[in-house]
């Protein structure tokens, strides 16, 4: 499956939007840093089947969408930027869904890669728990925004590696 050229442009736009969502200077938030235990192994070059990688990327973007579409995120972050962000993520999800269908077919996909998808979900649960414990403070959002930018960058790298293997 060939992801369209617009997909990588959308990735870059999403990252730019995340960067623009900064509300406070991050230098005051160092003490709020947290280890979310990003599931690095799901993004490494193991004997990754392309279909598995696409499923993991899809889950990553879906969970990012869920995280940023809560009432709390709307209250903490710029709504115009969030709306643009949703549009980019929605397009990414559509691109990846088309690919999943082509690569493995809709029936096998969720079951075959359950462990990988579960690892991504647990990662986002940890992020949500952190925000709850920190009462959705400005610094907590700043830490989460930085974390999502990092994980998003790693997702983009995985997509680039997939493209180069074609």
């Amino acid at each position: 499956c060939d992801l369209p050229q617009t997909h990588s442009l959308g990735n870059r736009r999403a990252l730019i939007l995340l960067a623009q969502m900064r509300r406070i200077s991050p230098f005051s938030c160092l003490k709020d840093r947290h280890d979310f235990e990003f599931p690095q192994e799901e993004f490494d070059d193991k004997q990754f089947q392309k279909a598995q990688a696409i499923s993991v990327l899809h889950e990553m973007i879906q969970q990012t969408f869920n995280l940023f579409s809560t009432k709390d995120s709307s209250a903490a972050l710029d709504e115009t930027l969030l709306d643009e962000f949703y549009i980019e993520l929605d397009q990414q999800l559509n691109d990846l869904e088309s690919c999943v269908m082509q690569e493995v077919g809709v029936i096998e996909s969720p079951l075959m890669y359950e462990d990988s998808i579960l690892a991504v979900r647990k990662y986002f649960q940890r992020i949500t728990l952190y925000l709850t414990e920190k009462k959705y403070s400005s610094c907590a959002w700043e830490v989460v925004r930085a974390e999502i930018m990092r994980s998003f960058s790693l997702s983009i790298n995985l997509q680039k590696r997939l493209k180069s293997k074609e």
């Epitope: 960067a19 991050p26 230098f27 938030c29 160092l30 003490k31 709020d32 840093r33 974390e147 960058s153």
Partner: antibody, heavy 121, light 107 residues
Amino acid sequence: EVQLVQSGAEVKKPGESLKISCKGSGYSFTSYWIGWVRQMPGKGLEWMGIIDPSDSDTAYSPSFQGQVTISADKSISTAYLQWSSLKASDTAMYYCARHPGLNWAPDFDYWGQGTLVTVSS
Amino acid sequence: DIQMTQSPSSLSASVGDRVTITCRASQSINEFLNWYQQKPGKAPKLLIYFASSLQSGVPSRFSGSGSGTDFTLTISSLQPEDFATYYCQQSYSTPLTFGQGTKVEIK
């Protein structure tokens, strides 16, 4: 391979201006902050300030606020430390180092080789 | 500002000795404490981050412990290449601050 390469040694007179540089390579320059550290002859390490190259946001140590300016040009992956009017007491080795920002990763894991600044009349 | 106080300021030891350096913060910094090694004419090198995590490529004879205000760097068996100056540094809040350093010399 991650590298921070600093500009060469400088010999200046009191009152002169100076801008030294730190060029990052082998990693995404805007994904890490760049910190500056001073070491006066025979002395310990002093943190001067830090910059986020993605948007040039800065934080300074109160001891250095107003004395130096930290800047960055992300298009050429370079951070700068500058003085508008040097003093003899600015004579020191200056190091740049990268910092992971708010991400859970090692602080100041890579350092430049240092730039020796000598200020003498 | 958070003050970082290291002790001792210098020590003499022999190859094979167990060496312990302590660092005390003027307020709680949780585990946001790093240890660096510096040799004459060289840039500092990160040894330990987040109080106890060993930086990649650093020998396992180096270890860090502590949280809150009191921290320790231990070299389990001193090697000839370990004679250097060691600095602790807090990354809990800006301004980031270093300890004054501990010079480890040959006895």
